[in-house]
């Protein structure tokens, strides 16, 4: 066993910064600031749009705003996945895409965002107040889920603005409690900074970190407001539940999907990332491969401390479909 990628730790401010403000007052804002800066990320956004052309057709777009790389995306409706929600699509970078009616086409838009078009007719069609949820699994940080629905007043063809994490369900114990503490901390930090601003500036001993003080003031409000968005999503709409799809006829596909405990499988769209036309599966297995770097001979961005990953703007190389479907 080995750990391939290490997440760079935030460096704490250096010790020995006791000035006229005193140790407690100076260190606390830095601790809180560190917490506030990290509390707001990562985040998931969900955008639900009703198509003007087909009034009962929906497009759901979801994205992950975070530094981690996505290794599984699950889209569900009627509530969060695993909490009464019904899976519509599962997207895996290597093994491909699987979807169930009324999902018409799921696809990767970028390496960290997906879109899903829903069919609009029949008993299983969505209605305007249906809740759609997207869950992004990022390794090894955990999974984050956000839910969204069309605003009651929205006109066809208009989309609800992206909802940044109405539900942030990190699979870490006590995340909500911690978020509450962090939110309080961020507010307290703001209060401290405001109070500090109205006070005559104390003379600090020379310090390498003092130039960062203005940045602290600039960061805090945005992060605090971001943290405020991370509230538990309580009102799951169940007035418009999808019909059971047990009568659907499976059409083969990759065997790894065979026993998913959702409804009977419709024909899988082969991983159609960055492609509008779905690629049908051939034979009993779908051959999929992780599409990594766009140019042959291009060196990969190795994961490691302090590394920023820059995805190729064109996404994975299109070999028989971007993920290698044959």
């Amino acid at each position: 066993m080995r750990t391939e990628a290490q997440v760079p730790a935030l460096q704490p401010p250096e010790p020995g910064l006791e000035g006229a403000m005193g140790h407690r007052t100076l260190v606390l804002p830095w601790v809180l600031l560190t917490l506030c800066v990290t509390a707001g990320t990562p985040e998931v956004w969900v955008q639900v749009r009703m198509e003007a052309t087909e009034l009962s057709s929906f497009t759901i777009r979801c994205g992950f705003l975070g530094s981690g790389s996505i290794s599984l995306v699950t889209v569900s409706w009627g509530g969060p996945n695993g909490a009464g929600g019904t899976t519509l699509a599962v997207l895996h970078p290597e093994r491909g895409i699987r979807q169930w009616a009324p999902a018409r086409q799921a696809r990767w838009e970028t390496q960290s965002s997906i879109s899903l078009i829903l069919e609009g007719s029949g008993a299983s069609s969505p209605c305007a107040n249906t809740t759609f949820c997207c869950k992004f699994a990022s390794f090894p940080e955990g999974s984050w889920e956000a839910c969204g629905s069309l605003p009651p007043s929205s006109d066809p063809g208009l989309s609800a603005p992206p909802t940044p994490a109405p539900i942030l369900r990190a699979d870490l114990a006590g995340i909500l409690g911690v978020s509450g503490v962090l939110l309080f901390g961020c507010v307290y930090l703001l209060h401290l900074l405001r109070r500090h601003k109205h006070r005559p500036a104390p003379r600090l001993q020379p310090s390498r970190t003092s130039p960062q003080a203005p940045r602290a003031r600039a960061w805090a409000p945005s992060q605090a407001s971001q943290a405020a968005l991370h509230v538990p999503y309580a009102t799951i709409n169940t007035s418009c539940r999808p019909a059971t799809l047990d009568t659907a006829h499976p059409h083969g596909g990759p065997s790894w999907w065979a026993s998913l405990p959702t409804h009977a499988a419709h024909r899988p769209q082969g991983p159609a990332a960055w492609a509008s036309t779905p690629i049908p599966a051939r034979g009993s297995f779908v051959s999929v491969e992780n599409g990594l770097y766009a140019q042959a001979g291009e060196r990969p961005p190795h994961t490691g401390p302090g590394l920023t990953l820059f995805p190729d703007p064109r996404g994975p190389r299109a070999m028989e479909g971007p993920l290698g479907v044959r």
Partner: antibody, heavy 120, light 106 residues
């Protein structure tokens, strides 16, 4: 820290069954495939199959379809592989492995292996 | 299923020597991955997606190839490189490994 902890060595008799375990820690167990690999002395690596615990989805190498059965217990973050009707051909070290695939990279995490000896 | 044939099965090389291990697939694959295994230890991912070095792998290693023909190369053999190397395809189920190449130091 991501870790896969496998159960201890097993000495079995021909015809019996054995259930190997692989306990995962350090990541969201339900969202990642656990693969099983066989290594016999003097032979190469063989891919047995895989399971996605959160979806109870399995995929087997046809060669091992009647030999291996994968299960998962999400409450204990443990994946199991049961090997049935054991013969001397099943004497091997069995590894559970997590290979994480994203658009950017592969990462691998291996259990320490469980040695199974089938002998009368 | 796709059969991967590695050659040579066993080879020895002197320190500083260039080493090339090949892996031939029975049908075309998109990428090839390579694993290193030393006696008594679990295998380790060594090269992924044909040419990308896994974390911690020395830069003297490289991988190349396409279609049905792939190779792993060590520009200058070192004692710590003595191990068994396996190629693996993940383009078509079931995933398969090559038979392995045991690399020894002279």
């Amino acid at each position: 820290q991501v870790q896969l902890q496998q159960s201890g060595a097993e000495l079995m008799t021909p015809g019996s069954s054995v259930k190997l375990s692989c306990k995962a820690t350090g990541y969201t167990f339900t969202d990642y495939w656990i693969e099983w690999v066989k290594k016999r002395p003097g032979h190469g690596l063989e891919w047995i199959g895989e399971i996605l615990p959160g979806y109870i989805s399995t995929n087997y190498n046809e060669k091992f379809k009647d030999k291996a059965t994968f299960t998962a217990d999400t409450s204990s973050n443990t994946t199991y592989m049961q090997l049935s009707s054991l013969t001397s051909e099943d004497s091997a070290v069995y590894y559970c492995v997590l290979i994480v695939t994203t658009y950017y990279y592969f990462m691998d995490y291996w259990g320490q292996g469980t040695s199974v000896t089938v002998s009368s | 299923q796709i059969v991967l044939t590695q050659s040579p099965a066993i080879m020895s090389a002197s320190p500083g020597e260039k080493v090339t291990i090949t892996c031939s697939a029975s049908s075309s694959v998109t990428y090839m991955h390579w694993f290193q295994q030393k006696p008594g230890t679990s295998p380790k991912l060594w090269i992924y997606s044909t040419s990308n070095l896994a974390s911690g792998v020395p830069v003297r290693f490289s991988g190349s190839g396409s279609g049905t023909s792939y190779s792993l190369t060590i520009s200058r053999m070192e004692a710590e490189d003595a191990a068994t190397y396996y190629c693996q395809q993940r383009s078509s189920y079931p995933w398969t490994f090559g038979g392995g190449t045991k690399l020894e130091i002279k």
